[in-house]
Each structure stands twice: as structure tokens, then as C-alpha cells.
């Protein structure tokens, strides 16, 4: 790659401070247009990031490889994209730097993304002060994307870009909709040509494994190193305060590199030099981190000791990133050739060897079939071995395959293969099978077909009360055998649920679909026995009846009285609901018929025992109503009722009975027999003076008939409160002589 | 050339439902918001919903909450609008619109009549 | 919600007038308000956006202004085309309510 470095004074209290160096360390570069070629170009770039016009930046070229870019007024001067042109021919390259502005609606949380093809970019911006209206993503200045202000997520907008390629490089900005470009988030995402870890035309080319946060160039597969490292892997740090391919470069100033951001050619992009981070560039790295944007940790062993510029500094007789490297060959011990893990399980393994130097923890690693290199967590150290510990990422399925160990020391390097077999815990597919009910136990069949990998460990069986949220009780069966639920609750419906184990740890698989089994009732044992009956009416039947005692609650839901019409072959069946009940009222029955009667106690759908039966005779229906019903006040506390017989008699009135109450008064009607039924009329004596009265009357023959219609009369004057009224009758042609 | 047109519209009984399309064709419209406008006769412009560009981002008029769902097919660049529960007050004339802030584009229309 | 107002809910005026129609928000809106146009038994139109930023293609007669809460829309010089309902809209965040429209007639 072209070296070629654009820095960014970040120094921001003072724009006319603000300055863009572009350094070459090419041979020759910058003299103009002898025979080295064209000079270094450094510019503003308006075509994507359109700001106000301000007064034309100055260009100062300091010797042959360097050119600076200053008088930059206010702050929106600074805002947007600039770029420096350097190199020759075909290595002509183009780096460039993105401004945001610091007092921006929104800004980026990181400037520069590099990805690999195919990879998802997440560009995440940060509300700085927000409004609330859609944000607007755009791509090298078209339009790309919304996002409502409310999908901020932890007060950032983020913008996936799944599956990037190459197409996709260039420059994003987010912006509140129709506001000023200078509140935009500026960001550049880089994306290399080929997948992680591949160079050349068809990708097909592996990358050396560039070190420190270098980046491999996907066309030619070299190390576009941090600034601050060198080599051809980037496993050289410069001195401090130096940048550069070969370190030659000195940052300005007293304080070295602090405030300033690099920018290298692509796919590397731009970040703090060695030993700074912050978006001004201006925080020291925080203890054991080191490099550019202090994304790199040391993690020194043996005695090294951690310098934010360079890394590890490591004792004598060590040497290597961590000071991990040192003399002898290893040999890893006794490997497993094939081990078995459950899906989703996070395992230790243990890979054990020796060597002198003595591995240590960081010298032994694993590799998964995918090429991901595990660390190890733990390392026990024994006279005669190292056991490193791995702690395995939560396996998925494409886990399974060959997987190695590998132990690398400064006297050399050795490997072991070991087959790794991904097991799938079982599922049931179907819900448990009921076989047989009863009141307090249900028998179930507990094997069903699963996905997923055998052989069945243990058959664990999980169940509860429908709708309840109490714990799940659990029962562990032998998977071949039937599974009889005890102490359960009588006609209660229990959601039942499987669940399968495989042997090994994580073998458990999910719980099964739920099944819904209900157990029985008990059987009502009590035996009822009437205690009497009552006719109300011609229709109705008042039937009152017994338990015997017996301790506990009292197992029913309610009695079932039967009532059977021989003569018509009908049965009558009256349901009452609760079981404290002791008396019922029969109504619509058939005047005249003879029932034979009896009761008894239900549970759910099962009848107790039937009480021994009683035999009613209904009386026949009664007269019709009397007719044309009329009330006549005689004085403050006498009304005269008058009325015709009923038509149609089916045989001799013994009665009428009178009913009286007072208009609107909230107290029981009071019935008055008038014993002569040749008589139409009668006097209700001692009512009340002044007082609305309500009458109606119906005649008996056997049983007694239909009320009359309800007639009003009001007392008259003003006379003293009476003791209540009585009746006295006669005919009504002698109440007129009279 | 950007172009909406939608489908979907005709008689329908109140209580009864009716999904509107909206084609899109001319711009990427996976980047887009959609709304649906609705115009009953003789009235103004009423906007009835959005859906922000993933599709899982929706928004709602208060008169159409609950009973309206907007969705959207990025693959088959369709806008839907599956309205549930319609009363005769949903009558109208459904259009589709793109937007970037303002609807800049709108599609024709689909007329929804709901009567009895 | 804010509640978009037109007024006046119809004019009509001769060929050449000067016009204008107002949209008050109920709450301020910033400019986050557009203008659109709708010619009888046709789609709406974007006219202005932004509450001043004329829509590509708008003849130049057409201008509108205000941020806030008060809105201008005005045709310098009406023209028998310009017969239609205008109606403004609020756009910058959910629910995007619109105006009742004002109608414009040629005397």
C-alpha cells in the first residue's frame, strides 16, 4: 500500500487553529511535475457534503512530502469530507478524512467502519440533542433511508447494512429530516473486496494475519498497519510520538500524537494514533490497552508490562505479542480423539502439554472447524504439563467437526485433531397420552416421538392446575414405562407437559406441548330423604328434604329433583344448583296429575343415591277470575268492593279471597276470605283515612283461581289512624237498598 | 419513473374487511416510508397510517387504530393496508403515497365502499 | 395532536389575482409543513415543502412562507389551471395531519 497519511489537528477551541497535513513517506512524492510524478493533493471535497461558502483555504507545502491545509475561519468550515491524492500510476491513492461537527444533532459513535464483504455494518449515531422528527440516512448524498425518531434505541438511530458489498463503500450521514448538513453524523464505511481474511482477484488468497489492528488490503495482501506499527504483519511498534510504514514520520508538537487523527489509504480508514482514543483524540489509554484508538489489550504474560504506544515490553529470555514466545518444542498429551456435546451447552475443554519453555495458558489455543480461535481461561501448571482450560462459546450445530488443539512456544509448535459430535436434545413432538382417570390420579403414557438425538436418558413428566401459576410439579420416570400422576385434586384439569433428556450435560431438552387431562369426580354417597311437601297452588309444589350427617365437606354440586306423571309417561327433572339447598319450589306442574317424587345428590355428571319416593296429588286447576271488580270509598276508613261471578264454573265457589294493600307500600298484601260465595259484594272496614288502596280477588272451588283485575280507591276525610282492615259482606243488592 | 398504483377496493358490508395493494415501481422502495391517505367523498385528505421502511415501524390515525394494519412486502415492493371491523364512515377513496418528510408521490387510488 | 386550520375553506377570485390562503398548527411545527395541490378528480400534488422550498416542477407563481404556527400559501397571479383544493400538511412526525382545504374558484 501507498504510505500516505492525512492528519487532523483536533485541537477544536479555535477553528484558525484546525489544521490537514498530508505526509508521504513515497520517494519523491510531492515535487510536482518532474520526472517523480504528480504532487500530493489535498482538498475539500464538496460533492457530498455541501457547507456554506467561506473564504478560500490556504495550501502550504512543507519540503517534498508534505502539504498542509489551514485558514479554516468557523467551525462549519471544518465540517465534511476532505481527501489527499498521492502516489503515482497505479498506486495513486485517495485518503480521506470525515469532519463531524462537535455541537451536532446527531453524532457518529464511530467515524470509520471497515468490513469484510458479505458482513452486516452497523452505523450508529448518537443523539446529541435531540428533535423529534424522522432522521434521514443518506449514502454519498442520496437519499437512503428513515427512521422515525422513536425507533432511537438507548438514544442512538441505527443503520444495519446486511450483507455489504463493495458498492456499498462511500460516505453515510444521518440528519433530522430538512435540517442543516452540519447537525449530521458523518460516517465512512470501507468494505474490502473479499470476505475476513482473503486477498486477490477471486478472494481466494489468505491473508498473513495482520497484527495490532492492521488491515489486510484485499488486492494486495499486504498489512495497511495502525499508525505507530510497522512490519509486514504490523508486529512492530514504532517509538512513541512516530508514524508511518517505516516509523519515519514524527508527530508535530510537544505532546506528540496527542489530538490528532490519522488517516490511512483503504481498507484501513482513520483512528487516533497509538496510545490516544477519545473523539478529539486527547484521553491516554486506560491500563493494559494499547495501540491506535487504544483498541488493542496487552494481556502480557511471563513479566511483561503493558505500554499504551507498543504493548507488551517483555523480560529477558521472552519475546512475542504477549512475551509468550520462548525455547523449546511442545507436545500436547493425550488428547480424546472424539467427544460429545449437547447444542447450546457452553463445555470446558482441557488440552494438556509440555515443553520447555513451559507452555503457559496464553501458548495453547483451540480451533473450531470455522477457524475461530479460542483462548483459554484457566491454565493449571504441573510439574510435568500445562492444562489449558477452554471455555467454549454456547456450540451451535455447525460446531460439529474437527477441531484443534495447538500449542505454540518460542522452541516451536504442536497440533492435535479431535472430532467433535454436536448432539440436538429431544423434543417431543405430541403431548402425553391419557390412559386412565380417576379422581385423584391420572395414568399416563409418557413416550411420544421426538426430534432432535437419542437415546432417551430420563423422561421427566411437568404438571399443574389449568390457569394456575403455582410451580410445575415434576416427576422423573423410566422412559418405558406408564406414569400414574397421585394426590391430584378431583375434577380439576391439569396441563400436562413432557420432557426429554439425552446423556450429557445440557441434555435436556425443551418441554413438549401441553395437554390438557381432567380428573374425575367423586361419586356422591349421601342418600336424601324428603321431609315434606307442599302444594302453593294448582301448579305449584313446595318440596323440602334432608341429608344425614356426615363429617367433612360435603361432596355435591346440587340435588336433582324427579317428579314422574305416570299416567302421561312424563318425566320432569328440576335442577338446584347448590348443595346447601334444602327446599325448592315446583312450578308449571299439571293441576289434577299424581307425581311420584323423589331426590338426589350430583357430583360433576354422577348422581348419588335416589331418596325413597314420595306420591303428590296435585289439586285440579281453580275458577276463572271474578268479574268486573269495582272499589267504592263509603267513608274515611270504609271502601265497598262489588263484582260478578266468574263465568264457565267447572263446579261450586267455597270462597273468594280478597287481597288489600296499601298503593305503593312496600309492606305484604293482606288476604281477607269472604266465606259466603252467593254474595257480590263486601265492605273492607278499619282502613286507613285518606289513604290509596290496591284490591284484586279470585274464587276457590277446590283450589284457588285466577286474581281478578287490581282496582284503586282512596279512603275519604281526615279520621283517626284505624287498627287495620276487616270485611264485612253482603249482597250487593242489599248494600244498594241500604 | 416512480409510479404507485393500488388495488384491492370495492363493496364491502360494515363489520367487514378489505386489503388494499399498493405496487410500487421506479425507486427503491425498501428505503422508503409509505403511508396510506384516505379521501372520503366530497371531503379533504385524511392520513390513515405509515410504515417506516424495515416495516417494523408503524404508525396510526386514532380512527383507524385497532381495526387498520399497514404491512409491507420489501420483495415484492407491495404496500398493504388490511382493514378489519370497517364501518361506513371508512368510505373513501385509499391512496398510497411515498414520502421523505412530504409525500412526493402518490398512487391513483382505490375506492372502498362500505355499505349495507 | 396537533390540529391543522385553513382558512378561508373557499375563495374565488379573477385570473391575474393575487391570492392567498393561511394554515394555522395548533402547536408550533418548526417549517415542517407542506402545501399540496388537488385539481378536481385527481391525485394531490406536493407543492411546497418546508414551508417555503417549491416542489421541482411548480411554476414559480406559487411561494409559500411562516414557521411556527402560522402558514402562508399565495399565487401572485392566478391562473384559470390553478383551480383546485389546497391543503397543508403537517410531516415532520406521526399522526401527519392535513388541513380541512381550501378551495380556489376563477370569478
Known amino acids: 500500500a501507498v504510505d500516505l497519511t492525512l492528519l487532523a489537528n483536533l485541537r477544536l477551541t479555535d477553528p484558525q487553529r484546525f489544521f490537514l497535513t498530508c505526509v508521504s513517506g513515497e520517494a519523491g512524492a510531492g515535487r510536482g511535475s518532474d520526472a517523480w510524478g504528480p504532487p500530493l493533493l489535498l482538498e475539500k471535497d464538496d460533492r457530498i457534503v455541501r457547507t456554506p461558502p467561506g473564504p478560500p483555504l490556504r495550501l502550504a507545502r512543507n519540503g517534498s512530502h508534505q502539504v498542509t491545509l489551514r485558514g479554516f475561519s468557523k467551525p462549519s468550515d471544518l465540517v465534511g469530507v476532505f481527501s489527499c491524492v498521492g502516489g503515482a500510476g497505479a498506486r495513486r491513492t485517495r485518503v480521506i478524512y470525515v469532519h463531524n461537527s462537535p455541537g451536532a444533532h446527531l453524532l457518529p459513535d464511530k467515524v470509520t467502519h471497515t468490513v469484510n464483504k458479505g458482513d452486516t455494518a452497523v452505523l450508529s449515531a448518537r443523539v446529541h440533542k435531540e428533535k423529534q422528527t424522522d432522521v434521514i440516512w443518506k449514502s454519498n448524498g442520496s437519499y437512503f433511508y428513515t427512521l422515525d425518531w422513536h425507533e432511537a434505541q438507548d438514544g442512538r438511530f441505527l443503520l444495519q447494512l446486511p450483507n455489504v458489498q463493495p458498492p456499498s463503500s462511500g460516505i453515510y450521514s444521518a440528519t433530522y429530516l430538512e435540517a442543516s448538513p452540519l447537525g449530521s453524523a458523518f460516517f465512512r464505511l470501507i468494505v474490502r473486496g473479499c470476505g475476513a481474511g482473503r486477498w486477490g482477484p477471486g478472494c481466494t488468497k489468505e491473508c498473513p494475519g495482520c497484527l495490532h489492528g492492521g488491515v489486510c488490503h484485499d488486492h494486495d495482501g499486504e498489512c495497511v498497519c495502525p499508525p505507530g506499527f510497522t512490519g509486514t504483519r504490523c508486529e512492530q511498534a514504532c517509538r512513541e510520538g512516530r508514524f508511518g510504514q517505516s516509523c519515519q514520520e514524527q508527530c508535530p508538537g510537544i505532546s506528540g500524537c496527542r489530538g490528532l487523527t490519522f488517516c490511512l489509504p483503504d481498507p484501513y480508514g482513520c483512528s487516533c494514533g497509538s496510545g490516544w482514543r477519545g473523539s478529539q483524540c486527547q484521553e491516554a489509554c486506560a491500563p493494559g490497552h494499547f495501540g491506535a484508538d487504544c483498541r488493542l489489550q496487552c494481556q502480557c504474560q511471563n513479566g511483561g508490562t503493558c505500554d499504551r504506544f507498543s504493548g507488551c515490553v517483555c523480560p529477558s529470555g521472552w519475546h512475542g505479542v504477549h512475551c509468550e514466545k520462548s525455547d523449546r518444542i511442545p507436545q500436547i498429551l493425550n488428547m480424546a480423539s472424539e467427544l460429545e456435546f449437547n447444542l447450546e451447552t457452553m463445555p470446558r475443554i482441557n488440552c494438556a502439554a509440555a515443553g520447555n519453555p513451559f507452555p503457559v495458558r496464553g501458548s495453547i489455543e483451540l480451533r473450531k472447524p470455522d477457524g475461530t480461535v479460542l483462548l483459554s481461561t484457566k491454565a493449571i501448571v504441573e510439574p510435568e504439563k500445562t492444562t489449558a482450560e477452554f471455555e467454549v462459546p454456547r456450540l451451535v450445530l455447525a460446531d460439529s467437526g474437527f477441531w484443534e488443539c495447538r500449542v505454540s512456544t518460542s522452541g516451536g509448535q504442536d497440533s492435535r485433531r479431535f472430532k467433535v459430535n454436536v448432539k440436538v436434545p429431544p423434543v417431543p413432538l405430541a403431548a402425553p397420552r391419557l390412559l386412565t382417570k380417576q379422581s385423584r390420579q391420572l395414568v399416563v403414557s409418557p413416550l411420544v416421538s421426538f426430534s432432535g438425538d437419542g437415546p432417551i436418558s430420563t423422561v421427566r413428566l411437568h404438571y399443574r392446575p389449568q390457569d394456575s401459576t403455582m410451580d410445575w410439579s415434576t416427576i422423573v420416570v423410566d422412559p418405558s414405562e406408564n406414569v400414574t400422576l397421585m394426590n391430584l385434586r378431583p375434577k380439576t384439569g391439569y396441563s400436562v407437559r413432557v420432557q426429554l433428556s439425552r446423556p450429557g450435560e445440557g441434555g435436556e431438552g425443551a418441554w413438549g406441548p401441553p395437554t390438557l387431562m381432567t380428573t374425575d369426580c367423586p361419586e356422591p354417597l349421601l342418600q336424601p330423604w324428603l321431609e315434606g311437601w307442599h302444594v302453593e297452588g294448582t301448579d305449584r309444589l313446595r318440596v323440602s328434604w334432608s341429608l344425614p350427617l356426615v363429617p367433612g365437606p360435603l361432596v355435591g354440586d346440587g340435588f336433582l329433583l324427579r317428579l314422574w306423571d305416570g299416567t302421561r309417561g312424563q318425566e320432569r327433572r328440576e335442577n338446584v344448583s347448590s348443595p346447601q339447598a334444602r327446599t325448592a319450589l315446583l312450578t308449571g306442574l299439571t293441576p289434577g296429575t299424581h307425581y311420584q317424587l323423589d331426590v338426589q345428590l350430583y357430583h360433576c355428571t354422577l348422581l348419588g343415591p335416589a331418596s325413597p319416593p314420595a306420591h303428590v296429588l296435585l289439586p285440579p286447576s281453580g275458577p276463572p277470575a271474578p268479574r268486573h271488580l269495582h272499589a267504592q270509598a263509603l267513608s274515611d276508613s270504609e271502601i265497598q268492593l262489588t263484582w260478578k261471578h266468574p263465568e264457565a264454573l267447572p263446579g261450586p265457589i267455597s270462597k273468594y279471597v280478597v287481597e288489600v294493600q296499601v298503593a305503593g307500600g312496600a309492606g305484604d298484601p293482606l288476604w281477607i276470605d269472604v266465606d259466603r260465595p252467593e254474595e257480590t259484594s263486601t265492605i273492607i272496614r278499619g282502613l286507613n283515612a285518606s289513604t290509596r288502596y290496591l284490591f284484586r280477588m279470585r274464587a276457590s272451588i277446590q283450589g284457588l283461581g285466577d286474581w281478578s283485575n287490581t282496582v284503586e280507591e282512596s279512603t275519604l276525610g281526615n279520621g283517626l289512624q284505624a287498627e287495620g282492615p276487616v270485611q264485612e259482606s253482603r249482597a250487593a243488592e242489599e248494600g244498594l237498598d241500604q | 419513473e416512480v409510479q404507485l398504483l393500488e388495488s384491492g377496493g370495492g363493496l364491502v358490508q360494515p363489520g367487514g374487511s378489505l386489503r388494499l395493494s399498493c405496487a410500487a415501481s421506479?425507486?427503491?422502495?425498501?428505503?422508503?416510508?409509505m403511508h396510506w391517505v384516505r379521501q372520503a367523498p366530497g371531503k379533504g385528505l385524511e392520513w390513515v397510517s405509515s410504515?417506516?421502511?424495515?416495516?417494523?415501524?408503524?404508525l396510526y390515525a386514532d380512527s383507524v387504530k385497532g381495526r387498520f394494519t399497514i404491512s409491507r412486502d420489501n420483495s415484492k415492493n407491495t404496500l398493504y393496508l388490511q382493514m378489519n371491523s370497517l364501518r361506513a364512515e371508512d368510505t373513501a377513496v385509499y391512496y398510497c403515497?411515498?414520502?421523505?418528510?412530504?409525500?412526493?408521490?402518490w398512487g391513483q387510488g382505490t375506492l372502498v365502499t362500505v355499505s349495507s | 395532536d396537533i390540529q391543522m386550520t385553513q382558512s378561508p375553506s373557499s375563495l374565488s377570485a379573477s385570473v391575474g389575482d393575487r391570492v392567498t390562503m393561511t394554515c394555522r398548527a395548533s402547536?408550533?411545527?418548526?417549517?415542517?409543513l407542506a402545501w399540496y395541490q388537488q385539481k378536481p378528480g385527481k391525485v394531490p400534488k406536493l407543492l411546497i415543502y418546508a414551508a417555503s422550498t417549491l416542489q421541482s416542477g411548480v411554476p414559480s407563481r406559487f411561494s409559500g412562507s411562516g414557521s411556527g404556527t402560522d402558514f402562508t400559501l399565495t399565487i401572485s397571479s392566478l391562473q384559470p389551471e390553478d383551480v383546485a383544493t389546497y391543503y397543508c400538511?403537517?410531516?415532520?412526525?406521526?399522526?401527519?395531519?392535513f388541513g380541512q382545504g381550501t378551495q380556489v374558484e376563477i370569478k
Open positions: 400538511q403537517k410531516y415532520n412526525s406521526a399522526p401527519r395531519p
Open positions: 402547536q408550533g411545527i418548526g417549517t415542517y
Open positions: 403515497a411515498r414520502a421523505v418528510g412530504p409525500f412526493d408521490y
Open positions: 410504515i417506516y421502511p424495515s416495516g417494523g415501524w408503524t
Open positions: 421506479g425507486f427503491t422502495f425498501s428505503s422508503y416510508v
